[in-house]
Interface confidence: low
């Protein structure tokens, strides 16, 4: 079954490589188990960047070597991305699923185009 | 624009073989699902088997379990559906049909043959070859 997704048309990285949005979703029915993953799409190809299962009203627990970190509020999960570089701009997309109780949703937010420009190197001070 | 066109049917004895293939146009298998279905006369669509082309998982129907193999060539953009040890209880209408990758669950195992065996999973259907079989 569909579910609406939103987030952030476009978003800039900081200088050091950290980009942070807000997925939410609309949740048709009371989810325990959601599970939140992040693509990203550039020159048609699409790759997981990094996902997460969590319970409600619990921490998102991602991998130990993951570029991700997120907290969830409600229906919002707050993500954040590290260690991005100018090659990493592309469309971020969120995705949602709320895995149990059934019956099983899935939610597909447009995509957040993350801009990372790589910082200029500081000159060499004598 | 997605276009998806099978080929392969036909009329064959009990206990023969075919292959069924899908040819896709308008994008890669790369990061889509492809199903086949099939719908005997007066009965419900049916999901046979599915590839997902993310991870090459397949997924079968038990009625055609250790019969059917499923399979892709992405260099031809085409994935097949090879049928052996057919029954008269495999006539039907045979449909290949595709989804987006992003549009896959986090399923696996018998979850996901639920999911992707579902017709309404499905966002882009071909047109469908007919497979006799009868003696």
């Known amino acids: 079954k569909a579910m609406h997704v939103a987030q952030p048309a476009v978003v800039l990285a900081s200088s050091r490589g950290i980009a942070s949005f807000v997925c939410e979703y609309a949740s048709p029915g009371k989810a325990t188990e959601v599970r939140v993953t992040v693509l990203r799409q550039a020159d048609s190809q699409v790759t997981e960047v990094c996902a997460a299962t969590y319970m409600m009203g619990n921490e998102l627990t991602f991998l130990d070597d993951s570029i991700c970190t997120g907290t969830s509020s409600g229906n919002q999960v707050n993500l954040t991305i590290q260690g991005l570089r100018a090659m990493d701009t592309g469309l971020y997309i969120c995705k949602v699923e709320l895995m149990y109780p059934p019956p099983y949703y899935l939610g597909i937010g447009n995509g957040t185009q993350i801009y990372v420009i790589d910082p200029e190197p500081c000159p060499d001070s004598d | 624009e997605v276009q998806l066109v099978e080929s392969g049917g036909g009329l064959v004895q009990p206990g023969g073989s075919l292959r069924l293939s899908c040819a896709a146009s308008g994008f890669t298998l790369d990061y889509y699902a492809i199903g086949w279905f099939r719908q005997a006369p007066g009965k419900e669509r049916e999901g046979v088997s599915c590839?997902?082309?993310?991870?090459?998982?397949?997924y079968y129907a038990d009625s055609v379990k250790g019969r059917f193999t499923i399979s892709r060539d992405n260099a031809k953009n085409t994935v097949y559906l090879q049928m052996n040890s057919l029954k008269p209880e495999d006539t039907a209408v045979y449909y290949c049909?595709?989804?987006?990758?992003?549009?896959?669950?986090?399923?696996?195992?018998?979850?996901?043959?639920?999911?992707?065996?579902?017709?309404?999973?499905?966002?882009?259907w071909g047109q469908g070859t007919q497979v006799t079989v009868s003696s």
């Open positions: 590839i997902v082309g993310s991870d090459g998982s397949t």
């Open positions: 049909a595709a989804v987006h990758g992003l549009k896959l669950p986090t399923l696996r195992g018998l979850g996901g043959s639920y999911y992707y065996l579902q017709a309404r999973s499905y966002d882009y």
